[in-house]
């Protein structure tokens, strides 16, 4: 799987899941953000060969076609595809509010 | 410019109703809470709630009652304010109003035109 | 809910004389070394325009004319050289607890 546990530990230049780490005040402005600071958002990137991680059917297609046409533009995009949620805590006021926000954090990647 | 344009005046009959938009430009819309606030002819002003528009996060005024849901359209960079069940006392005009950035609660500094809402059978 | 109670309701001030206008707060507004209080003005038919920031911070772009001060419950607001556009109701507003509240207005007129 092109996972953290598997692109975290390769020098790995096909499609996979790249650490990026998001600082709330520093990055995006939002000083409200209490805690976490900032996290580990994670990105996809890198080419996406014949087979690898093919999501459908359509993008096992593409990828055979980008092999034997490379000079074609159409190829398979390397996209997320296991999120995980964050939880932040920040204040209304002196109240303090917990939220947990759905797919902030890529785990995978695949090519799509 | 940072601007914050609202639509225009509605006449609304008591028990419906009214959803009143704010536009914004000339700044990042999802990286500032917004706020929504009334004003009573001749009254003062009342906080009715908020909404940080990269997730939808919403905090209300429970003097509303659950009447007022805020909502933001990040592709349009536009926020509305719905307001259900109206009476003869939400006779007011509604501004939006972007809040400071320091904190989720905060001043606010920049405002809509204000939208003005009669309800009258 | 915090309640400010703004005083006078009005005041009528002759040009370049100095108005004071005052704000206080049922519970203390300060937190972490800052008083959430702010100020605002509304002209006549216009919205409302943020004046003062976290008690004593002067917006940007506002005359160097307006001044806060105070911490805990008691605030005041001070105009000096008073000018014709000046007129208007004056709010305060605190954030220390929700909900965010405003006190009652201040109308200030030139006599």
């Known amino acids: 799987a092109l996972d953290t546990n598997y692109c975290f530990r390769n020098l790995e230049e096909n499609c996979c899941v790249r650490p990026l780490y998001i600082d709330f005040r520093q990055d995006l402005g939002w000083k409200w953000v209490h805690e976490p600071k900032g996290y580990y958002a994670n990105f996809c990137s890198g080419p996406c060969p014949y087979l690898r991680s093919a999501d459908t059917t359509h993008s096992t297609v593409l990828g055979l076609y980008n092999t034997l046409n490379p000079e074609a533009s159409a190829s398979p995009c390397c996209v997320p595809q296991d999120l995980e949620p964050l939880t932040i805590l920040y204040y209304v006021g002196r109240t303090p509010k917990v939220e947990q926000l759905s797919n902030m954090v890529v785990k995978s990647c695949k090519c799509s | 410019e940072v601007q914050l344009v609202q639509s225009g005046a509605e006449v609304k009959k008591p028990g419906a109703s009214v959803k009143v938009s704010c536009k914004t430009s000339?700044?990042?819309?999802?990286?500032?809470?917004m706020n929504w606030v009334r004003q009573a002819p001749g009254a003062g002003l009342d906080w009715m709630g908020q909404?940080?528009?990269?997730?939808?996060?919403?905090n209300y005024n429970e003097m509303f009652e659950g009447r007022v849901t805020l909502t933001a359209d990040t592709s349009t960079s536009t926020a509305y304010m719905e307001l259900s069940s109206l009476r003869a006392g939400d006779i007011a005009v509604y501004y939006c109003?972007?809040?400071?950035?320091?904190?989720?609660?905060?001043?606010?500094?920049?405002w809509g035109q204000g939208t003005l809402v009669t309800v009258s059978s | 809910d915090i309640v400010m109670t703004q005083t006078p309701p009005s005041l009528s001030v002759s040009p370049r004389e100095t108005a004071s206008i005052s704000c206080r707060a049922s519970?203390?507004?300060?937190?972490?070394?800052?008083?959430?209080m702010h100020w605002y003005l509304q002209k006549p038919g216009q919205s409302p325009q943020l004046l003062i920031y976290?008690?004593?911070n002067l917006e940007s772009g506002v005359s160097d004319r307006f001044s806060g001060s105070g911490s805990g419950t008691d605030f005041t607001l001070r105009i000096s050289r008073v000018e014709a556009n000046d007129t208007g109701v004056y709010y305060c507003?605190?954030?220390?607890?929700?909900?965010?509240?405003f006190g009652q207005g201040t109308k200030l007129e030139l006599k």
């Open positions: 507003q605190q954030n220390n607890e929700d909900p965010l509240t």
């Open positions: 909404i940080f528009p990269a997730w939808g996060s919403t």
């Open positions: 109003a972007r809040g400071y950035g320091n904190y989720a609660l905060d001043a606010m500094d920049y």
């Open positions: 976290l008690a004593s």
């Open positions: 000339g700044y990042t819309f999802m990286k500032y809470w």
């Open positions: 519970e203390s507004v300060d937190s972490y070394g800052n008083s959430f």
